[in-house]
Interface confidence: low
């Protein structure tokens, strides 16, 4: 069975996939659509690389420009650096500036619903 | 005005290797993928690969993984595709066709095509 | 890999007549199709995208329809100057693949 065949069949169940679901699907050829990327756990998807989403939805992956102000991309976004974002050539704005630090301050982001940065 | 600037005609010797160029204008070149695909005289249209210039990653055909190598050039804003252990089967015409993520993946431009004769 | 299957090579038909072009999906592609004409020592021309958006330039007699696995290109009033080869192509996974191609002839 391919990695097409794969998600299909499991399609109706990934609402509620973790986040290391979603990285072993992103190395199965799977392209997620849209739809189906955008119902997933907004907390599922946050940690997920830039290279893991243009992974896992393949050629759909310029979706993304369509829903970035719509969750979990927008917040998805909000966690990732500019820089990389810039490699999907998506325009996609919103990411951490470079030259910027991320601190993994799970009570801050838990607050405000961001990561905390410190500037450069 | 999009351009995608192929050169005509290649003859190759079979088991020689070629690189084929598409040199592009008119738009912003990091913010398109290039797709390389094969026409072979009176047949169909094959999809080789595409390369994202942002950051030269790529995908392939399974089919072309051991026939194309597919590189690109920010600095002159060309596209390459090397070929290489040619044999009459690779005698075709190789388009070069940019798609810009983020909006509609058809192709909605493509170049003049560049003819491949693979000949002793 | 999806199979796109355009089951007829040639279609036959006259100036102001109307033809459909078709194009099966091996599996469901939803409207993630493109389709595209190719006129005789020429690169192929856009003219549809998601199954039924016309680029721009495109004249409103090409039509496209369908969603899933069967789609349809439509040239109502046609024209000498359609006569060419029409691909379909699907975009909804890697790798993309293209039909076989169908030749409109003008009678």
């Known amino acids: 069975m391919n990695g097409s065949e794969y998600f299909v069949k499991i399609q109706s169940f990934l609402g509620g996939a973790p986040t290391e679901d979603l990285k072993a699907l992103s190395q199965q050829n799977v392209s997620m659509d849209l739809a189906t990327f955008m119902k997933l756990r907004t907390d599922a998807v946050l940690p997920l690389t830039v290279a893991e989403v243009q992974k896992l939805l393949g050629p759909h992956v310029e979706g993304l420009k369509a829903e970035e102000r719509h969750r979990p991309v927008r917040d998805w976004i909000l966690r990732q650096r500019q820089d990389d974002l810039d490699t999907l050539g998506l325009g996609l704005q919103g990411g951490i500036p470079n030259g910027y630090l991320v601190l993994d301050l799970s009570m801050q982001e838990a607050l405000s619903g961001t990561p905390c940065l410190l500037g450069p | 005005q999009v351009q995608l600037q192929q050169p005509g005609t290649e003859l190759v010797k079979p088991g020689a290797s070629v690189k084929l160029s598409c040199k592009a204008s008119?738009?912003?070149?990091?913010?398109?993928?290039m797709h390389w695909v094969k026409q072979r005289p009176g047949q169909g249209l094959e999809w080789i690969g595409n390369v994202n210039p942002s950051n030269g990653g790529s995908n392939y055909n399974e089919k072309f993984k051991n026939k194309a190598t597919l590189t690109v050039d920010k600095s002159s804003s060309t596209a390459d595709m090397q070929l290489n252990s040619l044999t009459s089967e690779d005698s075709a015409v190789y388009y070069c066709?940019?798609?810009?993520?983020?909006?509609?993946?058809?192709?909605?431009?493509w170049g003049q095509g560049t003819l491949v004769t693979v000949s002793g | 890999d999806i199979v796109m299957t355009q089951s007829q090579k040639f279609m036959s038909t006259s100036v102001g007549d109307r033809v459909s072009v078709t194009c099966k999906a091996s599996?469901?592609?939803?409207?993630?199709i493109a389709w595209y004409q190719q006129k005789p020592g020429q690169s192929p021309k856009a003219l549809i995208y998601s199954a039924s958006y016309r680029y721009s330039g495109v004249p409103d007699r090409f039509t496209g329809s369908g969603s899933g696995t069967d789609f349809t290109l439509t040239i109502t009033n046609v024209q000498s100057e359609d006569l060419a080869e029409y691909f379909c192509q699907q975009y909804n996974s890697y790798p993309l693949t293209f039909g076989g191609g169908t030749k409109v002839e003008i009678k």
């Open positions: 008119g738009y912003t070149f990091t913010s398109y993928w």
């Open positions: 599996q469901n592609v939803g409207t993630n």
């Open positions: 066709a940019p798609h810009y993520i983020g909006s509609r993946p058809g192709f909605a431009y």
